[in-house]
């Protein structure tokens, strides 16, 4: 979908402490040019997104995990 | 800049029906939520809905099932909000919300007035 | 639905004084020890703002004179010191579940 706008970095803040069972799924941005960074963008059960740390070791293992189930399916 | 921009204000007739937009800028809708919201002259905020563009899926306050329908079309960055069947209990100001957390923007609001 | 409660309706707090706003839920708003539970300003003619998302978390660019609090069913939010640009109609909203609800609102005058 072409979209006219610049876009940028989304996450300008990450959310802390959300746990993994409050999440539906993440979405994974890789660097480019509208962004330099990694960015993680979790999708919650309750009609919300929020931006999660990327270098955190609880969200690696949660895109670990989402990502294995997704090759599962 | 990252915002919200709603179309403007409408009257409209009873009985007939409304379509209001909000277009995003400076972020893409497919990954957020828009949420849409209404409020009364002098009366409190009101939950009418939310889809999730990335994939058309809606949810809806019971009391708007019928009343009110949200879409979105991600080529335009453009969520809508349509209201059929007009009456003056709808004469309100209607706000779609960015939902993120951490960064929640809102429109600027539109004011849709219900008179013959 | 979950029906919210705020208390009290409208207060009227001195400059630099603490204000307190209370937001009890029918039900709990929690899932897995996050609490859905969101605080937002309104000022005249102007959208809500977010303040407090997920009960204690602070939004982007919001002072640190506010903050929240709480978990399940009772909720607060503080102001403190309150300022004169504070002067506002705060409502509490969960999103724990569908449908989400708002509180009717509790409007901040400052003396």
């Known amino acids: 979908a072409s979209v006219a706008t610049e876009l940028r970095c989304q996450c300008l803040q990450t959310l802390q402490g959300i746990h993994p069972k409050n999440i539906q799924s993440v979405n994974v941005k890789s660097p480019g040019p509208h962004c330099a960074q990694t960015e993680v963008i979790a999708t919650l059960k309750n009609g919300r997104k929020a931006c999660l740390n990327p270098a955190s070791p609880i969200v690696k293992k949660i895109i670990e995990k989402m990502l294995n189930s997704d090759k599962s399916n | 800049e990252l915002q919200l921009q709603q179309s403007g204000a409408e009257l409209v007739k009873p009985g007939a029906s409304v379509k209001l937009s909000c277009t995003a800028s400076?972020?893409?809708?497919?990954?957020?939520?828009i949420h849409w919201v209404k409020q009364r002259p002098e009366q409190g905020l009101e939950w009418i809905g939310r889809i999730d563009p990335a994939n058309g899926n809606t949810k809806y306050d019971p009391k708007f099932q019928g009343k009110a329908t949200i879409t979105a079309d991600t080529s335009s960055n453009t969520a809508y909000l349509q209201l059929s069947s007009l009456t003056s209990e709808d004469t309100a100001v209607y706000y779609c919300?960015?939902?993120?957390?951490?960064?929640?923007?809102w429109g600027q609001g539109t004011l849709v007035t219900v008179s013959a | 639905n979950i029906v919210l409660t705020q208390s009290p309706a409208s207060l009227a707090v001195s400059l630099g004084q603490r204000a307190t706003i209370s937001c009890r839920a029918s039900?709990?708003?929690?899932?897995?020890?996050?609490?859905?539970m969101h605080w937002y300003q309104q000022k005249p003619g102007q959208p809500p703002k977010l303040l407090i998302y997920?009960?204690?978390n602070l939004e982007s660019g919001v002072p640190v004179r506010f903050s929240g609090s709480g978990s399940r069913t009772d909720f607060t939010l503080t102001i403190d010191p309150v300022e004169a640009d504070d002067a506002a109609t705060y409502y509490c909203q969960q999103n724990n579940e569908d449908p989400f609800t708002f509180g009717s609102g509790t409007k901040l005058e400052i003396k």
């Open positions: 400076g972020f893409n809708i497919e990954d957020t939520f």
């Open positions: 919300e960015e939902g993120r957390y951490g960064v929640a923007y």
């Open positions: 997920l009960a204690s």
């Open positions: 039900e709990s708003v929690d899932s897995y020890g996050n609490s859905f």
